[in-house]
């Protein structure tokens, strides 16, 4: 069973700057789960409010 949210292909191992790449199955695209203290589409910004 394919989940809705799983590992990214190897080509995107560096896609997320401060976080983990996850492949969104429904949208057919990679997305980033940011580490604590980071925000942005690719976790590229430090969260100044954190």
């Amino acid at each position: 069973v394919v989940s809705h949210f799983n590992d990214c292909p190897d080509s995107h191992t560096q896609f997320c700057f401060h976080g983990t790449c996850r492949f969104l199955v429904q949208e057919d695209k990679p997305a980033c789960v940011c580490a604590s203290g980071y925000v942005g589409a690719r976790c590229e910004h430090a969260d100044l409010l954190a």
Epitope: N6, P9, S11, Q14, F23, P30
Partner: antibody, heavy 114, light 112 residues
Framework: VQLQQSGAELVRPGASVKLSCTAS????????MHWMKQRPEQGLEWIGR????????KYAPKFQDKATMTADTSSNTAYLQFSSLTSEDTAVYYC????????WGQGTLVTVSA | DIVMTQAAPSVPVTPGESVSISCRSS???????????LYWFLQRPGQSPQLLIY???NLASGVPDRFSGSGSGTAFTLRISRVEAEDVGVYYC?????????FGSGTKLEIK
Amino acid sequence: VQLQQSGAELVRPGASVKLSCTASDFNIKDDYMHWMKQRPEQGLEWIGRIDPANGNTKYAPKFQDKATMTADTSSNTAYLQFSSLTSEDTAVYYCATSWGFPYWGQGTLVTVSA
Amino acid sequence: DIVMTQAAPSVPVTPGESVSISCRSSKSLLHRNGNTYLYWFLQRPGQSPQLLIYRMSNLASGVPDRFSGSGSGTAFTLRISRVEAEDVGVYYCLQHLEYPYTFGSGTKLEIK
């Protein structure tokens, strides 16, 4: 998302050419930009991709010494430069972005001729 | 590099009939996450390629449901039912699993 490519180029053998691809309704820093080559009446070849957010590039081996990809995030534009042009480089060049290439530019025809 | 093979350079079809276009990969495109990273594109004459099918069997936005994709890890089929005149063009498969991404050589759909 729209990708607008620069106009057709007629260039001499041995010269270089720099093509552009400007995105609208989309921040190029949010995803990779890819370039493809299509020779007349031929198939598609993946040249490589650039990460506009940091300039990191990946090239297909055959284009490693021929192509240079760059990006300018202030103008939301990606560039492809081809050097030491020969007749083999006569082709339409496409930019495409996002996973699975749902968005393509209209293509730029480069003709290499003396 | 992963080699993508489209054995048939062209396929003739009568409008209203169905047609299948095949593609093979030299390596399985099934990722450990369960997704198969095989994509289909149509390039109409004088136009940029258009995404038809993503991850082997999923219909891209705005694409008629006359198009469908199927396959295994290395053998793939694009099926067009009730072919229309607007379907003419060259169909390409693409492996989106690993660098360098590679396309098949293309299969031209021609109306009889």
